[in-house]
Interface confidence: low
Amino acid sequence: ATKLTEEKYELKEGQTLDVKCDYTLEKFASSQKAWQIIRDGEMPKTLACTERPSKNSHPVQVGRIILEDYHDHGLLRVRMVNLQVEDSGLYQCVIYQPPKEPHMLFDRIRLVVTKGFSGTPGSNENSTQNVYKIPPTTTKALCPLYTSPRTVTQAPPKSTADVSTPDSEINLTNVTDIIRVPVFN
């Protein structure tokens, strides 16, 4: 089995997570791609996806999540704007290839969002803060109903602190994945 690795990304409330996921250009350029959260003891849940077929450089917005697929470069760009502490968790990019299982793009992203302290010396002044300009031409895409199956082992008690995301039906919960994976290995 492929060893799962994750990268930790620490941001403050109100900032923007800006992730890029690489994929094999020739194989997946026009395939539908998705951004998923992996909750303890559950199958990955799709939060947002590109259109099908995926359009080049065409922003898709679902709530606070914006996806842009750069076909020419084999990159899916994912942004989560105006981050909240409850957004902390484990995320991944996948490529939908029905009827086959979704293809996971490495690495998974461990997002840790902490309370921001406005005006604190040393705070990241240059990073994107609460005010974020969404591209004017965005599309809200419908994602396939299925999620990638996963072996579920001894699911721990789930957090009940779900937070609704504006403009969408998704929830982001402060959870960690049951699979323990090395960071930077």
Epitope: E7, Y9, V19, K20, C21, D22, D107, I109, S127, F184
Partner: antibody, heavy 127, light 107 residues
Framework: QVQLVQSGAEVKKPGSSVKVSCKAS????????FSWVRQAPGQGLEWMGG????????NYAQKFQGRVTITADESTSTAYMELSSLISEDTAVYYC????????????????????WGQGTTVTVSS | DIQMTQSPTSLSASVGDRVTITCRAS??????LAWYQQKPEKAPKSLIY???SLQSGVPSRFSGSGSGTDFTLTISSLQPEDFATYYC?????????FGQGTKLEIK
Amino acid sequence: QVQLVQSGAEVKKPGSSVKVSCKASGGTFNRYAFSWVRQAPGQGLEWMGGIIPIFGTPNYAQKFQGRVTITADESTSTAYMELSSLISEDTAVYYCASSHFYGSGSSNYYYYGLDVWGQGTTVTVSS
Amino acid sequence: DIQMTQSPTSLSASVGDRVTITCRASQGISSWLAWYQQKPEKAPKSLIYAASSLQSGVPSRFSGSGSGTDFTLTISSLQPEDFATYYCQQYNSYPYTFGQGTKLEIK
């Protein structure tokens, strides 16, 4: 792996501008993030700013904001750094450096740090 | 801005010695730290990325460790070519700041 070749040494008058180029070869230009770092004589390294050509928007250190412009030209695989309103304290060696971000699936475009450096361009500001 | 503080600022050692240089960040930077080696009149060379990963082609006597705010660069057995200045750099958030450098000299 990419190689970075910078433009030659420059002598400039105070108040003028300098534009240093950094040509990348041996790699796919849009798979790299580029930074500009300077080093005054006998001093340490100072990060001025950076750009990820595929996304276009540069980031600058506050100290240089309004005086530095970092651009990238995909058609020629070249990154540029222009510094205006030069003063004698801008006399330094200016380095471009790149970070390869292909294949890591990374949430940080500089995942590998500044793994390749140009040879440096000496800029002397003198009246 | 995140301040990076290296210690010591200079260090005298002999060939074969084990040497440790430390770098402290003014706030947490996860593992987004790199180490560079610079020799006089030369461009810096990358040694370590992501706090502990060795760049391709760098000898295994170099190693890095740490996360959050405290990091170390260790040279297990100094070689003549290792006498140089070493810099740490955080790339957790803009601007990507460097430490002030540690000059490693022959005793």
